[in-house]
């Protein structure tokens, strides 16, 4: 008596495809696909493609992630980016002659525009493009804390590289903190790791958009690559929906 | 036409219990339960209970871990501990007057006794018992690298505490490296985090078994709590079995 | 591991990750996702034989636990183990949006 | 989350983690594990209704994806999500051994 069952691969694939159709719409909280009637003709805007590519690169660099996901994490996250306050801003004045660190300031109101409420933020990454370098250096990241104090956030050992490379730091907690405070300018400090007995505390890493050699015609390209915050957040309207359906479970 | 099926909870439980019976034996690579004929009478030895408790505490402190596990990780890991070389050893002489760090040395031959081959090691943790403290301090851990150079391993922000507390650092890679080298004395340095502009670089953290106030009668208790390596490794005989069945997949 | 490296290059009958590329336009009839044009969704398929503690050849049964029922389930099932997210670009009205969808790509499977 | 907090305090019919305490002596007839005497193994049980894209009340169906078929499986299954290890003490001959068994305790379940 055989208990073998032949699996209908085509049926399984069809069911999987149908399930994916529902999955994508449900993750976006859409009852049906959005109409394309208003989509402007022509290719996607440059900035949108850059943002998509940043996100795609992040995915490729991530290990596969089978972690238990809270309900809110099931739903899609909108991705936006907030560029660092331009280097010509007066706020950078007093940081000019410090050799062990570089500074990056952000306008909280720009962040709040992308993420209106702190709980909506699911991830924030500080992205810096490091220029090619022949030296190894241990670097640290700090958050501006009060007038002249800095809070340690993390570190990285940077090995020599022949090509520019993106560095990414998880700063979700910091950005959520900024959103909980009033508007204003907030910042990060990227420093050489100064050990207790080391004498040479100079930062040997050059960061795109911060290093002084800026050629005029490369301005906008350079600008696209200056340090930025990559934000992932639940859109407000999706969050309200989520909040109101909490009673289900 | 109803397609409801009543679930026989008792049958499900029975099947789960049977599966667990097989699971435990298979994780230990035992074809049958070990005979208890030679088990000495009386309670478990103190040292074994201490080791069991260390492991159990580690589990409780860990978040649930649904990560994909490589085949080797399916099987049970034997847990052992290797105590730090005694403080009276001459090796500590030249580290006595350094205020920014404390030093812990280990005998590689003791480690090799517990883990005969580097690939068998699945996890190594450096465990330190920090005494109660009213100050917050940012600390760093380094590995002895060559004669007088140290390699950065990690850091921790230690907040004030009213009770002694165990600190744990994952040092799997380091211990695996030591096992790949010859026998000898290897070590860790536990330091204050010295920032580029900070003046006070003193380590304010007291570690049990290292701090000087050692009262005679508390020697052995103190000894149990001196820094140690908690090692998790596949027993050699189980590993050989695993190796020979590799061809299956 | 029952991952794409092993499963795509073998004829494994038991639980394994299977290839499935979804073309948004062709398979779902959707033109509204502007990037990417499709993605390797994949799926898990194949039996996870339930191993009761049969006394015959018990040691052989035990060796199979790791593959067929590592979680000692009462009825093990072939399910995704490692998953990856998928970023997409689409428009809401005139506004382009970049969103990341979690757990969309199956990289490996397991009996659970 | 379909974890012990939620499932042990509700009468959820669908996929949930169910209570199961294993007493090594009573349930398995084993005296050879010296510590612990038993442990909360738990298990996953309950249907994960497959949600085909039923056109009726589609928006209601979509709201259920997160619960019943978050991975968009062709046949979703109730399986462990978060697992914890179990340390044990036993003797081999006269030698006591402390070993850690991975993924022994089911803390939460999911439809996968």
């Amino acid at each position: 008596l055989s208990t073998c069952k032949t699996i209908d691969m085509e049926l399984v694939k069809r069911k999987r495809i149908e399930a994916i159709r529902g999955q994508i719409l449900s993750k976006l909280r859409l009852a049906s696909p959005p109409s394309q009637g208003e989509v402007p003709p022509g290719p996607l805007p440059e900035a949108v493609l850059a943002l998509y590519n940043s996100t795609r690169d992040r995915v490729a660099g991530e290990s596969a992630d089978p972690e238990p996901e809270p309900e809110a994490d099931y739903y899609a996250k909108e991705v936006t980016r907030v560029l660092m306050v331009d280097r010509n801003n007066a706020i950078y004045e007093k940081t000019k002659d410090i050799s062990h660190s570089i500074y990056m300031f952000f306008n909280t109101s720009d962040i709040r525009e992308a993420v209106p409420e702190p709980p909506l933020l699911s991830r924030a990454e500080l992205r810096l493009q490091r220029l090619k370098s022949s030296v190894e250096q241990h670097v640290e990241l700090y958050q501006k804390y009060s007038n002249n104090s800095w809070r340690y956030l993390g570190n990285r050992l940077l090995t020599p590289t022949d090509t520019p490379e993106w560095l990414s730091f998880d700063v979700t907690g910091v950005v959520r903190q900024w959103l909980n405070q009033g508007d204003g300018i907030q910042g990060f400090r990227f420093s050489a790791h100064c050990s207790c007995d080391s004498k040479d505390n100079k930062l040997h890493v050059e960061i795109n958009g911060i290093s002084p050699k800026r050629r005029g015609d490369l301005g906008t390209i350079h600008d696209m690559n200056r340090p930025f915050l990559l934000l992932m957040a639940t859109p407000l309207e999706r969050a309200q929906h989520l909040h109101s359906s909490r009673h289900r479970r | 036409l109803s397609t409801c099926k009543t679930i026989d909870m008792e049958l499900v439980k029975r099947k789960r219990i049977e599966a667990i019976r097989g699971q435990i034996l298979s994780k230990l690579r035992l074809a049958s339960p070990p005979s208890q004929g030679e088990v000495p009478p009386g309670p478990l030895p103190e040292a074994v209970l201490a080791l069991y408790n260390s492991t159990r505490d580690r589990v409780a402190g860990e978040s649930a871990d649904p990560e994909p596990e490589p085949e080797a990780d399916y099987y049970a890991k034997e847990v052992t501990r290797v105590l730090m070389v005694d403080r009276n050893n001459a090796i500590y002489e030249k580290t006595k007057d350094i205020s920014h760090s404390i030093y812990m040395f280990f005998n590689t031959s003791d480690i090799r006794e517990a883990v005969p081959e580097p690939p068998l090691l699945s996890r190594a943790e450096l465990r330190l018992q920090r005494l109660k403290s009213s100050v917050e301090q940012h600390v760093e851990l380094y590995q002895k690298y060559s004669n007088n150079s140290w390699r950065y391993l990690g850091n921790r922000l230690l907040t004030p505490t009213d009770t002694p507390e165990w600190l744990s650092f994952d040092v799997t890679g380091v211990v695996r490296q030591w096992l790949n080298q010859g026998d000898g004395i290897q070590g860790f340095r536990f330091s204050a985090h010295c920032s580029c502009d900070s003046k006070d670089n003193k380590l304010h953290v007291e570690i049990n078994g290292i701090s000087p106030k050692r009262r005679g009668d508390l020697g052995t208790i103190h000894d149990m709590n001196r820094p140690f390596l908690l090692l998790m490794a596949t027993p050699l005989e189980r590993a050989q079995h695993l190796h020979s069945s590799r061809h299956r997949r | 591991a029952l991952d794409t490296n092993y499963c795509f290059s073998s004829t494994e009958k038991n639980c394994c990750v299977r290839q499935l590329y979804i073309d948004f336009r062709k398979d779902l009839g959707w033109k509204w996702i502007h990037e990417p044009k499709g993605y390797h969704a994949n799926f898990c398929l194949g039996p996870c034989p339930y191993i009761w503690s049969l006394d015959t050849q018990y040691s052989k049964v035990l060796a199979l636990y790791n593959q067929h029922n590592p979680g000692a389930s009462a009825s093990p099932c072939c399910v995704p183990q490692a998953l990856e997210p998928l970023p997409i670009v689409y428009y809401v009205g005139r506004k382009p949006k970049v969103e990341q969808l979690s757990n969309m790509i199956v990289r490996s499977c397991k009996c659970s | 989350a379909l974890d012990t907090n939620y499932c042990f305090s509700s009468t959820e019919k669908n996929c949930c983690v169910r209570q199961l305490y294993i007493d090594f002596r009573k349930d398995l007839g084993w005296k050879w594990i010296h510590e612990p005497k038993g442990y909360h193994a738990n298990f996953c049980l309950g249907p994960c209704p497959y949600i085909w894209s039923l056109d009726t009340q589609y928006s209601k169906v979509l709201a259920l994806y997160n619960q019943h078929n978050p991975g968009a499986s062709a046949s979703p299954c109730c399986v462990p999500q978060a697992l914890e290890p179990l340390p044990i003490v036993y003797y081999v001959g006269r030698k006591p051994k402390v070993e850690q068994l991975s993924n022994m305790i089911v803390r939460s379940c999911k439809c996968s």
């Epitope: 009852a31 696909p33 959005p34 109409s35 | - | 009839g29 809401v92 009205g93 005139r94 506004k95 | -």
Partner: antibody
Framework: EVKLVESGGGLVQPGGSLSLSCAAS????????MSWVRQPPGKALEWLGF??????????EYSASVKGRFTISRDNSQSILYLQMNVLRAEDSATYYC???????????WGQGTTLTVSS | DIQMTQTTSSLSASLGDRLTISCRAS??????LNWYQQKPDGTVKLLIY???RLHSGVPSRFSGSGSGTDYSLTISNLEQADIATYFC?????????FGGGTKLEIK
């Protein structure tokens, strides 16, 4: 409960102007596009235009038949939608509906309508 | 502009009947086809969106199907409350356009 109530209809002479209003309740007004649709007596429905939501900057879109003569606006603080109609013609006589528009290309809730008659 | 054509302007049926109303687009509208019901008092309600999705609160005796340029609305087990005019509308390309309507009467 989503509710849309139009008002302001009546009799107007050709060449004249009139403003219609639509009071919305039961939903977050700024999240939605709002639209005007009309139906001449015994004829089909005709889409006139919409005003977009907050994320889309409250910009407007019109059908060719009313572009330049009709203006859609909104008062978000009061949740009111307006249709300002100028240089009215006899063929503008119709029942005017305000409707909530969704990104899916459909109108999910409609008002009861208000009637405009353009006649001398 | 995309033209929407409902060839049957009026339809007569008996209570309990199953009937189908059709709608054709002048070009492929990728399933962005919606159906509305207008009662004799002028009240308009959405019934079905994106070809076959039932709007909340709409009885399941209403269903929709179709693809490309041809679409239909089916009412099974006709009730007195279903007496109305039914309009189709495309949401694929601006400007949104409606069909001429199909008026349903009881025999």
């Amino acid at each position: 409960e989503v509710k849309l109530v139009e008002s302001g209809g009546g009799l107007v002479q050709p060449g004249g102007s009139l403003s219609l209003s639509c009071a919305a309740s039961g939903f977050t007004f700024t999240d939605y596009y709002m639209s005007w649709v009309r139906q001449p007596p015994g004829k089909a429905l005709e889409w006139l235009g919409f005003i977009r939501n907050k994320p889309n900057g409250y910009t407007t879109e019109y059908s060719a038949s009313v572009k330049g003569r009709f203006t859609i606006s909104r008062d978000n603080s009061q949740s009111i939608l307006y249709l300002q109609m100028n240089v009215l013609r006899a063929e503008d006589s119709a029942t005017y509906y305000c409707a909530r528009y969704t990104g899916g290309g459909y109108f999910d809730y409609w008002g009861q309508g208000t009637t405009l008659t353009v006649s001398s | 502009d995309i033209q929407m054509t409902q060839t049957t302007s009026s339809l007569s049926a008996s209570l309990g009947d199953r009937l189908t109303i059709s709608c054709r687009a002048s070009q492929d509208i990728s399933n962005y086809l919606n159906w509305y019901q207008q009662k004799p008092d002028g009240t308009v309600k959405l019934l079905i969106y994106y070809t076959s999705r039932l709007h909340s609160g709409v009885p399941s005796r209403f269903s929709g199907s179709g693809s490309g340029t041809d679409y239909s609305l089916t009412i099974s087990n006709l009730e007195q409350a279903d007496i109305a005019t039914y309009f189709c509308q495309q949401g694929d390309t601006l400007p949104w356009t409606f069909g001429g309507g199909t008026k349903l009467e009881i025999k």
